[in-house]
Interface confidence: low
Amino acid sequence: DAHKSEVAHRFKDLGEENFKALVLIAFAQYLQQCPFEDHVKLVNEVTEFAKTCVADESAENCDKSLHTLFGDKLCTVATLRETYGEMADCCAKQEPERNECFLQHKDDNPNLPRLVRPEVDVMCTAFHDNEETFLKKYLYEIARRHPYFYAPELLFFAKRYKAAFTECCQAADKAACLLPKLDELRDEGKASSAKQRLKCASLQKFGERAFKAWAVARLSQRFPKAEFAEVSKLVTDLTKVHTECCHGDLLECADDRADLAKYICENQDSISSKLKECCEKPLLEKSHCIAEVENDEMPADLPSLAADFVESKDVCKNYAEAKDVFLGMFLYEYARRHPDYSVVLLLRLAKTYETTLEKCCAAADPHECYAKVFDEFKPLVEEPQNLIKQNCELFEQLGEYKFQNALLVRYTKKVPQVSTPTLVEVSRNLGKVGSKCCKHPEAKRMPCAEDYLSVVLNQLCVLHEKTPVSDRVTKCCTESLVNRRPCFSALEVDETYVPKEFNAETFTFHADICTLSEKERQIKKQTALVELVKHKPKATKEQLKAVMDDFAAFVEKCCKADDKETCFAEEGKKLVAASQAALGL
């Protein structure tokens, strides 16, 4: 429904607090380098303007679109050209091209300093001195580092962040109370950001149809008792929500997400029996809870799929009349019967079914041609099952750190041109699949593992897209969304790679490594491992293991020494020489 003033409509729907928070997120996701104070000033100006429109929707400029209003505001930033370079050219464009231009300049890996956590007392003082600024700063810092973070979900994180400080800053042992909560929020936040990044990549790189197919499969697994029409409605509404958020339309996105949560809760009897608890919560918690809700039980006595999709003489007629709907029904029926399959596997099966019908419905005897289509599914199902089995066995044998190292070696040999920080980050995340999913029973392993790997490989794809260096990565990332993981799995050692020149500086370490956290120390060692493989791609597992064991012993020895720096300098030279000899460098 059209409103005289879109900005007034959203301000009234969302309330001032959410309006301001969402505008701050939007601005920080677009202008990732701008100082906090500049963004707060812009947000306050927009908010004051919105209030004038609430008072009188016919007031000057109140009829302008949100993109026009926000874009005009962003383009008033004085240092736009100096700070952002060619992004300033966006301001010469008209809407909608101007917004598209801003979107294209979002940076998945902005050159921003690492967030260092201050002392607990310092944080608590800042929280008590000015709670509003403290929480705004949290939104700003997360949003600028994660330009595709799901904005309404970031409001939920901010609410939990505030609750953590409210509780823990009064506790006897503030640190013991607060630090685990902040660690949990950080880890969950990174996971949430990566999951949303995949949704946006799906929409932006592969289109609405690809996202809808993903949503049909996932919602059908989650709500197997819901009718197809109900799932279809939810899919369309969910697609609108994510299209808006991925497109920078954060006010509309948050508003529509709230409407969707309301609809789901009002209609939970026809959707899922698992929604009751979620629907009793306040809005932000409710939306989060619905998004994470467990799969409902499958209806008893579901008939065989073969009757409607293989044995029926009307398969080609039904397919021809409404192809996407028929395929949507196939996906819905298959997914609701298979909560044990990953979404990407279900999409591969649907694609195979579609390809078969395209071929067979043009054949002389269509039924004869597609009669064995379900047999084609068997190898597609077995491939991820076998891969997960093998990797979980390896994980159980090695533990997380060494499993990550095995993946680091594997992926560096596949795509050695990729930057070392990206290989370390991606391989560490790939390795986390073990502790995340291998503990699950068989029926939950595949959806956990393969859908998680899709999220992690998308991180590789978006980071690589910024600075493309490997045709193999580009190929696996762009050819098929659902076949990305099999594509990377199938890559062998890159025989065309010319090994990196040996540089002793890469393997020079200092006493500062001793004061690092265990995680940071692991990253240092894993960085060295990647560099070793880049120097000697044909090194065997045994050779690499020997060098890494020597390296671990070297770090341990020097960190215990009285004169740490001298130890690192002298023993380091010996280690480099021994490693060169061991690897034949």
Epitope: V216, E227, F228, A229, S232, T236, S270, K323, M329
Partner: nanobody, 115 residues
Framework: QVQLVESGGGLVQPGGSLRLSCSAS????????MGWYRQAPGKQRELVAS???????HYADTVKGRFTISRDNSKNMVYLQMNSLEPEDTAVYYC?????????WGQGTQVTVSS
């Protein structure tokens, strides 16, 4: 392919009634929204009434109490009963049906309210 055909339009005097029908030919599964929109000359197309998968209805403020939307799921039909028609209701009326496959529109049927 799915095709929508509207019928029931025509010329009617102010205060009169008309019943518009829309039928979907071709198989269309999983309908979650059926609606009627209208477009008067020189104006934008606007929602008149809609009915969702759960049967809940929505009406434009200008037609509330005068128009009633209904659907027949078994026949993929949607109807618009228009009573107490006014000259301002003159427009081309379009039927809209949505499902997971897309958004389907009819060609429109002319409604003219004039004495």
């Amino acid at each position: 392919q799915v095709q929508l055909v509207e019928s029931g339009g025509g010329l009617v005097q102010p205060g009169g009634s008309l019943r518009l029908s829309c039928s979907a030919s071709g198989s269309i599964w999983g309908i979650y929204h059926m609606g009627w929109y209208r477009q008067a000359p020189g104006k934008q197309r606007e929602l008149v009434a809609s009915i969702t998968v759960d049967g809940s209805t929505h009406y434009a403020d200008t037609v509330k109490g005068r128009f009633t939307i209904s659907r027949d799921n078994s026949k993929n039909m949607v109807y618009l009963q228009m009573n107490s028609l006014e000259p301002e209701d003159t427009a081309v009326y379009y039927c809209d049906i949505r499902n997971v496959g897309g958004d389907y529109w009819g060609q429109g049927t002319q409604v003219t309210v004039s004495s």
